[in-house]
């Protein structure tokens, strides 16, 4: 049963439809696009969020900024297949029967193929590097203040256990946040680093997924931290399988 608020909205996912159609007339919330019941006490999986986003009006779609780096999300938005628990299915295909394998954050990790392509397992992304460039400020931020504020943000806003924020690096104007979470470390109930990173990415872009909360107002010792560029790198537990043509391009 979804743990939604009494006024029948989903605090952690605005891309839902909620109604008091549950047991005893209690509130239930379902993700747009998939119609899947979501747990409103925690982050919704990235797969269900992408599916919901693709069901929104076309003018609401924006492509992810391309990059030359491997396992940066070059492919932009697509309408993913999610499993019964909201995770990405290992193999994704489009309407023209072009298929590819993805990792646990839904990023392509193989060359594209046809329907005969096999993706034996969903490979876990265990290390995410979020690379930010902030707008110019009067002076550099204090590194330890910045570190503490970003850790607090991931703990309080995204409910990510502090042990999964491995490091915060800072060389003005570049900030790097490292998230690490092996399969063996992730306990029942732990927020997935991929979901936290996706919520953070949408917050940074001014597209908050939270219901009724204001946008992200990041401040370090009262000084606004305004991000002007974001790149996210994904490292998988098993290296990706791309042809040499792509790697040398």
């Amino acid at each position: 049963h979804t743990a939604a608020q009494d006024n029948c909205t989903c605090p952690t996912n605005k891309m839902t439809v909620c109604s008091p159609d549950g047991p005893g007339g209690r509130c239930q919330c379902r993700a747009l696009g998939s119609g899947m019941a979501v747990d409103c006490s925690t982050l919704t999986s990235k797969c269900l969020l992408l599916k919901a986003r693709m069901s929104a009006p076309k003018n609401a779609r924006t492509l992810v900024r391309p990059s030359e780096h491997a396992l940066v999300d070059n492919d932009g938005l697509y309408d993913p297949d999610c499993d019964p628990e909201g995770r990405f299915k290992a193999r994704q295909c489009n309407q023209t029967s072009v298929c590819w394998c993805v990792n646990s954050v839904g990023v392509r990790r193989t060359d594209k193929g046809d329907l005969s392509l096999r993706c034996d397992e969903l490979v876990r992304t265990h290390h995410i590097l979020i690379d930010l460039r902030h707008r110019p400020t009067a002076g550099a931020f204090n590194h330890s203040d910045l570190d503490a504020e970003l850790r607090r943000l991931f703990r309080e806003r995204y409910r990510l256990h502090p042990k999964f924020v491995a490091a915060v690096h800072y060389e003005q104007p570049t900030i790097q946040i490292e998230l690490r979470q092996n399969t063996s470390q992730k306990a029942a109930g732990d927020v997935d680093i991929g979901d936290a990173a996706y919520y953070f990415e949408r917050d940074i872009k001014g597209e908050s997924l939270f219901q009724g909360r204001g946008g992200l107002d990041l401040r370090v010792r009262g000084e606004p931290l305004q991000v002007e560029r974001t790149l996210i790198y994904y490292l998988d537990e098993i290296p990706p399988k791309f042809s040499m043509k792509r790697l040398t391009a």
Epitope: H1, A3, D21, G22, G24, V38, G86, A188, G189
Partner: antibody, heavy 123, light 112 residues
Framework: QVQLQQPGAELVKPGSSVKLSCKAS????????MYWVKQRPGQGLEWIGE????????NYNEKFKSKATLTVDKSSSTAYMQFSSLTSEDSAVYYC????????????????WGQGTSVTVSS | DVVVTQTPLSLPVSFGDQVSISCRSS???????????LSWYLHKPGQSPQLLLY???NRFSGVPDRFSGSGSGTDFTLKINTIKPEDLGMYYC?????????FGGGTKLEIK
Amino acid sequence: QVQLQQPGAELVKPGSSVKLSCKASGYTFTSYWMYWVKQRPGQGLEWIGEINPSNGRTNYNEKFKSKATLTVDKSSSTAYMQFSSLTSEDSAVYYCTREGHNYDGSLGAMDHWGQGTSVTVSS
Amino acid sequence: DVVVTQTPLSLPVSFGDQVSISCRSSQSLTNSYGNTFLSWYLHKPGQSPQLLLYGISNRFSGVPDRFSGSGSGTDFTLKINTIKPEDLGMYYCFQSTHQPYTFGGGTKLEIK
């Protein structure tokens, strides 16, 4: 795997109170409502009430409203039921049980049960 | 409160039999959104009750396909094909459409 651990038995005196515990593991505690169910010796099952561990919201069977108080401790993933002003009528086995899965549609059904705590009210 | 009536109270069987248990409610268990929260449980001596069916007819994981459910509104049926020794015990239906949620009185499945 999902587990709901309850102590085996409690012996309490008439007029006193008892606080029964139910420790959950193997799933996201705050994502599923918890029910409490009573079974008197040789009798059927009775629904006492439910609690949403995410926000502490409760719904009670009117019959137990002045008798039972449901609470949770999120930090330890434990649900509690306090039973007050105990009489011999309260001697029973009390089960905590989790409401069904978010994804498979088994809402309103009790998919996992604790082993039950046998409460004996006797002087 | 919604009264849930189960029949029969006792059901003597032989192994291999096919049986049906009836569950009737004093008002419709289908809410205004079309959802019916009716589930069935088996309670064996010395164990906790276990979920068999939810949403009238959906088998819970690990429940054999000899258990099936049907019905709508106020009338529901649990059918067990080819009774086995492990099927003996008390069967309860449970409605969670209306507060307070209520159980049927139970049906004891026992050997003849």
